[in-house]
C-alpha cells in the first residue's frame, strides 16, 4: 500500500474499514444518495447511463469523484484510476451502489489521471463514463496520515 497525506476519515472510509477490510475510499460532499428500488431494468435493455462525472482535486494527492445516476438499485460502482500516460498500473476500486461520490487518495501530485466508472444493475454493467483531471501541484491541507491499500492493477504481468 501507499501512505496518503491530506485525507480526513469520512463516513464511507469508516464503513469500508468496518465492513470491507479495505480502507481506500471516502465520500465527497454530496454523497450517500440511496437508490430507491429498481425500475425493472433487464440485461436485454440498454443499461441506464451514469451522468455528470466530475473530478476535482482533494489535497495534493487526491481526487474527488461525483456522479449522478438514475434512481435505481445499483449493486456496485466500479472505478478505475489510471495515469494519463499509463506509466503505472491502473488502480481499481469497488464501492457500494448507494454512493454518488468518493474520494480517491494516495495518488501522485501534479499528475494527470483518467478516471472511469460504471455501475452494475441486476447483474449487468452500465456504459463506462470517463473524465480527466490532475492532482494539485503542492502540499496543502495536510491532515493526519492514513494508510491506503489499493489492489493490484489489471494491466500487468500475467501468470497462467
Amino acid at each position: 500500500g501507499s501512505t496518503a497525506i491530506g485525507m480526513k476519515e469520512t463516513a464511507a472510509a469508516k464503513f469500508e474499514r468496518q465492513h470491507m477490510d479495505s480502507p481506500d475510499l471516502g465520500t465527497g460532499g454530496g454523497s450517500g444518495i440511496e437508490g430507491r428500488g429498481s425500475m425493472g431494468y433487464r440485461g436485454s435493455e440498454q443499461a441506464p447511463e451514469l451522468e455528470n462525472l466530475t473530478v476535482t482535486e482533494v489535497g495534493w494527492d487526491g481526487l474527488r469523484l461525483n456522479w449522478t445516476a438514475a434512481d435505481q438499485a445499483y449493486e456496485h460502482f466500479i472505478i478505475q484510476v489510471q495515469e494519463a500516460n499509463k506509466v503505472e498500473a491502473a488502480r481499481n476500486l469497488t464501492v457500494p451502489g448507494s454512493l454518488r461520490a468518493v474520494d480517491i487518495p494516495g495518488l501522485k501530485a501534479a499528475t494527470p489521471y483518467t478516471v472511469s466508472i460504471y455501475g452494475v444493475i441486476q447483474g449487468y454493467r452500465t456504459p463506462v463514463l470517463s473524465a480527466e483531471a490532475s492532482t494539485a501541484s503542492g502540499l496543502n491541507d495536510i491532515f493526519e496520515a492514513q494508510k491506503i491499500e489499493w489492489h493490484e492493477g489489471t494491466h500487468h504481468h500475467h501468470h497462467h
Partner: antibody, heavy 118, light 108 residues
Framework: QVQLVQSGAEVKKPGSSVKVSCKAS????????ISWVRQAPGQGLEWMGG????????NYAQKFQGRVTITADKSTSTAYMELSSLRSEDTAVYYC???????????WGQGTTVTVSS | DIQMTQSPSTLSASVGDRVTITCRAS??????LAWYQQKPGKAPKLLIY???SLESGVPSRFSGSGSGTEFTLTISSLQPDDFATYYC??????????FGQGTKVEIK
C-alpha cells in the same frame, strides 16, 4: 502480481457435491472479482459465475443457478465454488480467474480436475 | 443469458496468413467483449478486452474490433505460436459472462 492457486483433483460420485478452492496472493483480494469457468474434456469454456469478495454477493450463469454456490473468505484470501447434484457431464477442469475493470479474465488458476463417476 | 456465436469453428491457415475470427452476440453488448487464446492443457490467456484494447504483453499482430453485436479478432500475420483455440466472451454480465464456442486455428 496476482497468483491464484487452486485445490487438487477430485473424484466424486453422481449426486454428491464438490467444493473447489482458489487462494489468491498479490493485490487486495477483497476488491477484485473472481470468476469460475469450467471446461469439459474436448469442449469449450463455460462461465459459471463470479463474486466480489468485498461485498460477498455472487452472480451466476442461468445454466448453473440453484446448483452452484460461490463464496469467498476475505480472512484467507480464498474463493470457493461448490457444485451440487453432480452428474457425469460435470466432469471437467474448473478454473478460477480474476477479472479486470472491463471484465476480461487476466489471471487464471492452474485448474482443478473434477471427475464424476460411479 | 446473452448467447455468443463464433465462426468459423475451425480455421486452417499457414504461417504469415491474415486470420479473422468473428463473434456475434444475441443482443447488444456495446464493447463489453474479450478474446482469449488457449493451448491444450493450459489455462486461457487474455488477448483483448473492451473489444479492442490489447492486453499488456500481447503481440501487436492481434487486434480486435466491433461493437454492439458484431466483433472480430484479427491476427495480421499468423505465427507458429498462434496455432491454438480462440474464444470470445461477453462481459456485459457482471462480473463476467458467456463464452463463444471457440475457433480452432490449425495448420493448413
Amino acid at each position: 502480481q496476482v497468483q491464484l492457486v487452486q485445490s487438487g483433483a477430485e473424484v466424486k460420485k453422481p449426486g454428491s457435491s464438490v467444493k473447489v478452492s482458489c487462494k489468491a496472493s498479490g493485490g487486495t483480494f477483497s476488491s477484485y472479482a473472481i470468476s469460475w469457468v469450467r471446461q469439459a474434456p474436448g469442449q469449450g469454456l463455460e462461465w459459471m459465475g463470479g463474486i466480489i469478495p468485498i461485498f460477498g454477493t455472487a452472480n451466476y450463469a442461468q445454466k448453473f443457478q440453484g446448483r452452484v454456490t460461490i463464496t469467498a473468505d476475505k480472512s484467507t484470501s480464498t474463493a470457493y465454488m461448490e457444485l451440487s447434484s453432480l452428474r457425469s457431464e460435470d466432469t471437467a477442469v474448473y478454473y478460477c480467474a480474476k477479472g479486470n475493470f472491463y471484465g476480461g479474465l487476466d489471471y487464471w488458476g492452474q485448474g482443478t480436475t473434477v471427475t464424476v463417476s460411479s | 443469458d446473452i448467447q455468443m456465436t463464433q465462426s468459423p469453428s475451425t480455421l486452417s491457415a499457414s504461417v504469415g496468413d491474415r486470420v479473422t475470427i468473428t463473434c456475434r452476440a444475441s443482443q447488444s453488448i456495446s464493447s463489453w467483449l474479450a478474446w482469449y487464446q488457449q493451448k491444450p492443457g493450459k489455462a486461457p490467456k487474455l488477448l483483448i478486452y473492451d473489444a479492442s484494447s490489447l492486453e499488456s504483453g500481447v503481440p501487436s499482430r492481434f487486434s480486435g474490433s466491433g461493437s454492439g453485436t458484431e466483433f472480430t479478432l484479427t491476427i495480421s500475420s499468423l505465427q507458429p505460436d498462434d496455432f491454438a483455440t480462440y474464444y470470445c466472451q461477453q462481459n456485459k454480465k457482471f462480473p463476467s459472462g458467456t463464452f463463444g464456442q471457440g475457433t480452432k486455428v490449425e495448420i493448413k
